[in-house]
Interface confidence: low
């Protein structure tokens, strides 16, 4: 950005700047971030017996250690490894649900279909969902004023690197048939630059994953097109096939009916297409 150019010209390091000059383009750390993370951790471990052994104070310490005192444009996946280790969790085969640009519906689905899991149904995803955080170089403070924006400032920021790290791990541990929910209302139904397109697709393990099944969610009630024929879906099929993973695609024409039929599969209207 322009600010970066000025600093580069003056050969001033970010950490040498007065505090008021360290303004990033993105919004600051979510209010009460530490307490929110800890409260979510305690709540998660209460509800998930298999994670009762997790010490939430240690989880917070590892989370904090990944970004506190570090220059927030120089965060690495390595920084998050202690946290990833503490949050190790496995999903049964055939039960992984990935999503791209359609988070709400994916979460509504796993709330009903309790034996399927998105990343945000796992401990680490649950802790960080919808939160923003960053620190400051050489201080122990959390920056509540501003954090780096992925486009305007830098991609190696604490939030982006976190999601890249945990998404990679989530994809690596998937097995069986993996499902992905895609937004059929977007111009790019499959976007190579999304987390799904740039991280998860490339980290599915062919020796463990037999197939990827895409569910393309239609937006309009009268939309009867076969979006599985969309050029971007064909691109996804090509990437997946080259990785020796089979590819299937389904149109979900009526997402409302789709959810209703997940809740009540015996409903007579669910025997027809959705």
């Amino acid at each position: 950005s322009g600010l970066n150019d000025i600093f580069e010209a003056q050969k001033i390091e970010w950490h040498e700047l007065p505090r008021w000059r360290q303004q990033w383009s993105g919004s600051g750390t979510t209010s009460r971030f530490p307490e929110t993370v800890l409260a979510r951790c305690v709540k998660y471990t209460e509800v998930h017996p298999e994670m009762r052994h997790v010490d939430c104070q240690s989880v917070w310490d590892a989370f904090k250690g990944a970004f506190i005192s570090k220059y927030p444009c120089n965060i690495t996946e390595e920084d998050y490894q202690p946290l990833v280790k503490l949050g190790t969790q496995t999903v049964p085969c055939n039960k992984t649900l990935l999503w791209s640009r359609i988070k709400d519906l994916a979460h509504q689905f796993t709330q009903v279909q309790r034996d399927m899991f998105t990343l945000e149904d796992m401990l680490l995803g649950y802790l960080a969902d919808d939160l923003t955080w960053c620190g400051e170089f050489n201080t122990f403070e959390i920056n509540y004023q501003s954090c780096p924006d992925w486009r305007k400032d830098c991609s190696n920021n604490p939030v982006s690197v976190f999601w890249k790290t945990v998404s990679r791990r989530f994809a690596e541990t998937a097995c069986g048939v993996v499902h992905v929910m895609l937004n059929g209302s977007r111009s790019k139904i499959f976007d190579k630059n999304s987390t799904f397109g740039s991280v998860e697709v490339h980290n599915l393990q062919p020796e463990k994953v037999q197939a990827l099944e895409a569910w393309v969610i239609h937006g309009g009630r009268e939309d009867s097109r076969d979006l599985c024929q969309d050029p971007t879906i064909k691109e996804l099929e090509s990437i997946i096939s080259k990785r020796n993973i089979r590819f299937f695609c389904k149109n979900i024409y009526r997402p409302d009916k789709f959810l209703q039929c997940v809740k009540n599969p015996e409903d007579s209207s669910c025997l027809s297409g959705i």
Epitope: S31, R32, P34, E35, A39, K43, E46, D61, Y144
Partner: antibody, heavy 117, light 111 residues
């Protein structure tokens, strides 16, 4: 791990006081919600205020706003300041630790504050 | 502020008996409710959190249930050591506030 309150005693109406909650066996540099609760003689528990030790953000019962101030004063102490004391403030004041989700699993023994002329 | 209404204010039961204490919240609080036991001259002791989860080291004779606005604490196979005052507490935390409220308390007398 324990909490110990101090600063109680006999105080004049209209006066001020500061109660201290000292933590031992753990550090408030870690993330906890620390709270103050009071109990008038023979009465029930009444929540006063909480502070998040990570963010420093505070929350008060509606009736406590303005006259009570909770603060983290060091890595081992949380303080409750009270002003404009009245006889109705006579109570045992407890501090409690919450590891972050409402489970107040550690309490101090309490300190008695008596407001009387 | 949330108001917690606890009933009854006092209850008497024999050793080996069962006691039920009810707590009603003025607005829905999900399952974010705790129960405490307090004996004279002592601070409260956490019994149950998340409406039904037993705190560490607490006897399984204590059982919490309910969600939303209606909650119940049941003490079965009553022991003389259970004589105490019991309080419910709502703790409907969000990322922006830590509101808490206690019920008025229920004194349990064991005959």
């Amino acid at each position: 791990q324990e909490l110990v309150e101090s600063g109680g005693g006999l105080f004049q109406p209209g006066g001020s006081l500061a109660l201290t909650c000292k933590a031992s066996g753990f550090s408030l540099s870690n993330i906890y919600v620390m709270c103050w609760v009071r109990q008038a003689p023979g009465k029930g528990l009444e929540w006063i205020a909480c502070i998040g030790t990570g963010s420093g953000d505070t929350d008060y019962a509606t009736w406590a706003k303005g006259r009570f101030t909770i603060s983290k004063t060091s890595s081992t102490t949380v303080t409750l300041q009270m002003t404009s004391l009245t006889a109705a403030d006579t109570a045992t004041y407890f501090c409690a630790r919450d590891p972050g989700a409402g489970t107040w699993n550690l309490w101090g023994p309490g300190t008695l504050v008596t407001v009387s002329s | 502020d949330i108001v917690m209404t606890q009933t009854p204010s006092s209850v008497e039961a024999a050793v080996g008996g069962t006691v039920t204490i009810k707590c009603q919240a003025s607005q829905t609080i999900g399952s974010r409710l705790a129960w405490y036991q307090q004996k004279p001259g002592q601070p409260p002791k956490l019994l149950i959190y998340s409406a039904s989860t037993l705190a560490s080291g607490v006897s399984s004779r204590f059982k919490g249930s309910g969600s939303g606005t209606q909650f119940t604490l049941t003490i079965s196979d009553l022991d003389s050591a259970d004589a105490a005052t019991y309080y419910c507490q709502s703790y409907y935390y969000t990322s922006t506030s830590y509101p808490n409220a206690f019920g008025g308390g229920t004194e349990v007398v064991v005959k």
